[in-house]
């Protein structure tokens, strides 16, 4: 009774198509599969960025797989062949592992790469990234930004740089069609007569870096002798009302400060008849139903009631 063995996949490699971190893992079927013609062979693929403690594991019948990686670090992957138990009249048979690695050969000392990279997707409409030059680099150093997301044929270079002292220190992006809810890849590289410049890679999803406009049209309405309803409107733009959280800051007679977080465009405040002055501001943020993270907007203009009976007047700014 001979032991059934199977070879690992052949020509296992990681291919970089130039998408700034979105890589292809591909392989060929193992040698000597003739004995298992009636069998559907599967492959178990494990991969990770070097330094990560956990492997991602995929079982597939295909000869390729695609995923995003951090190109600031190396990538390691391994794969083996799986013969299901139906093919072997017994337990599942696994081949030995085939292994491969990939990394971008760096140039430049780490300090030369851009510092404090910061990207904000303003009002879910306009992406702006800014950075500081690397430490110790001369003014002849120029940085270039490239980006890619699924849907683009190839990586694109920024065409509208923000400059300071002749150096690129940021990028205003054009309209980015169908670019949210998917990984957005950026590489900032550089050149200098003086010294090599280290490239930096960044990956994020646009909906997670949205900074909305502040709410508008703040109003007061007296609901009862001891209740005032504060109302506002969602800012202009593409963000639907269901995507907002709000933070309100209310000041009563220059003493009491109330802060509250709400999901709707209203807030009911308990007051006393003695209230002489009431002011409030609101800011907005994309909520957990529409993103994993976000940036608070600036505060709205302050809306105040002063010196009149709130029941007699609804203020509209």
């Amino acid at each position: 009774d001979t032991e059934i063995k199977v070879n690992p996949p052949q020509d296992f490699e990681i291919v970089d198509p130039g998408y700034l971190g979105y890589l292809y893992l591909q392989w060929q079927p193992p040698l000597s599969l003739d004995h298992f013609k009636e069998c559907t062979v599967e492959y178990e693929l494990k991969y990770r960025n070097i330094g990560s403690e956990t492997w991602k594991t995929i079982i597939t019948k295909n000869l390729h797989y695609k995923d995003g990686f951090d190109l600031n670090k190396g990538i390691e992957a391994k794969i083996h062949t799986l013969l299901p138990w139906q093919c072997t009249n017994g337990s599942e048979v696994q081949s030995s592992w085939a292994e491969t690695t990939y990394w971008i050969s760096p140039q430049g000392i780490p300090e030369t790469k851009v510092q404090d990279m910061d990207c904000v997707y303003y009002n879910w409409q306009y992406l702006l990234c800014s950075w500081k030059p690397g430490i110790g680099v001369l003014l002849d150093t120029n940085y270039n930004l490239f980006y890619w997301y699924e849907g683009l044929d190839h990586a694109l270079q920024c065409v509208d740089y923000i400059k300071a002292d002749g150096q690129n220190i940021g990028c205003r992006f054009p309209y980015l069609e169908a670019s949210d809810y998917k990984d957005f890849y950026i590489c900032v590289n550089g050149s200098s007569e003086n010294k090599p410049i280290r490239s930096s890679y960044f990956t994020f999803q646009l909906q997670n870096i949205v900074k909305p406009l502040p709410p508008v049209y703040l109003t007061f309405t007296r609901e009862s002798s001891c209740e005032i309803k504060l109302k506002w409107s969602i800012p202009l733009g593409p963000i639907p009302a269901r995507c907002f959280d709000y933070e309100i800051e209310i000041r009563e007679d220059d003493t009491t400060l109330v802060t509250a977080t709400v999901e709707n465009e209203t807030y009911t405040l308990k007051t006393t008849n003695e209230t002489r002055q009431l002011c409030f501001v609101v800011r907005s943020k994309v909520n957990i139903y529409c993103s994993d993270d976000g940036i608070w907007s600036e505060w709205s203009d302050k809306q105040c009631w002063e010196g009149e009976d709130l029941s007699k007047k609804t203020l509209l700014r």
């Epitope: 190396g74 990394w103 760096p106 140039q107 000392i109 780490p110 430490i135 090599p196």
Partner: antibody
Framework: EVQLVESGGGLVQPGGSLRLSCAAS????????VHWVRQAPGKGLEWVGV???????DYNSALMSRFTISKDNAKNSLYLQMNSLRAEDTAVYYC??????????WGQGTLVTVSS | DIQMTQSPSSLSASVGDRVTITCTAS???????LHWYQQKPGSSPKLWIY???NLASGVPSRFSGSGSGTSFTLTISSLQPEDFATYYC?????????FGGGTKVEIK
């Protein structure tokens, strides 16, 4: 097996020149950068410079004007050209492979003595 | 330049002792770029600990590294005869790359 072998060291007079070689095997200089590091007798380690895989170079600015690093990818070899040598350049010169921003393999070193 | 200052410059210890070597940087260094090398007389340096706390291949688990910012340490939990050597810290963050002056671990 990764190996780095330095050669070209010896006795040279002050003001003279010397060219050190570093023969690499088990990896390609088109994929990895290689550093030169020196160690004066009984002293610590001093970084000289690095030739990156892509061909660009970083130097210790204190030595940059007198030392030049080059490589020949076809021969998988790295070179250190040292000019206007001084007594304080006397040291063992090592080449070391760059891997993930550390020096993971070192050669055995070659001794350069600058003396009249 | 970032100065790397090691202390002590030498120490005498016995087999089984716990040994701690400190490395202080003159400017903050990312832990990713702080490494330790071991060198024995007549031999070239060997990468011993990389990125502050990761042991290089073949390094015994009695060695550990820690630290952040400007202060880093290499610790040997129970000194063995083969550990007697000189240890250098090294920053790979800023040019020029620099090494500490070394700590020589000798047999008491």
């Amino acid at each position: 097996e990764v190996q780095l072998v330095e050669s070209g060291g010896g006795l040279v007079q002050p003001g003279g020149s010397l060219r050190l070689s570093c023969a690499a095997s088990g990896f390609s200089l088109t994929k990895y950068g290689v550093h030169w590091v020196r160690q004066a007798p009984g002293k610590g380690l001093e970084w000289v410079g690095v030739k990156w895989a892509g061909g660009s170079t970083d130097y210790n600015s204190a030595l940059m004007s007198r030392f030049t690093i080059s490589k020949d990818n076809a021969k998988n070899s790295l070179y250190l050209q040292m000019n206007s040598l001084r007594a304080e350049d006397t040291a063992v010169y090592y080449c070391a492979r760059d891997h993930r921003d550390a020096m993971d393999y070192w050669g055995q070193g070659t001794l350069v003595t600058v003396s009249s | 330049d970032i100065q790397m200052t090691q202390s002590p410059s030498s120490l005498s210890a016995s087999v089984g002792d716990r040994v701690t070597i400190t490395c202080t940087a003159s400017l903050s260094v990312s832990s990713t770029y702080l490494h330790w090398y071991q060198q024995k007389p007549g031999s070239s340096p060997k990468l011993w600990i990389y990125s502050t706390s990761n042991l290089a291949s073949g390094v015994p688990s009695r060695f550990s590294g820690s630290g952040s910012g400007t202060s880093f340490t290499l610790t040997i939990s129970s000194l063995q005869p083969e550990d007697f050597a000189t240890y250098y810290c090294h920053q790979y963050h800023r040019s020029p790359l620099t090494f500490g002056g070394g700590t020589k671990v000798e047999i008491k």
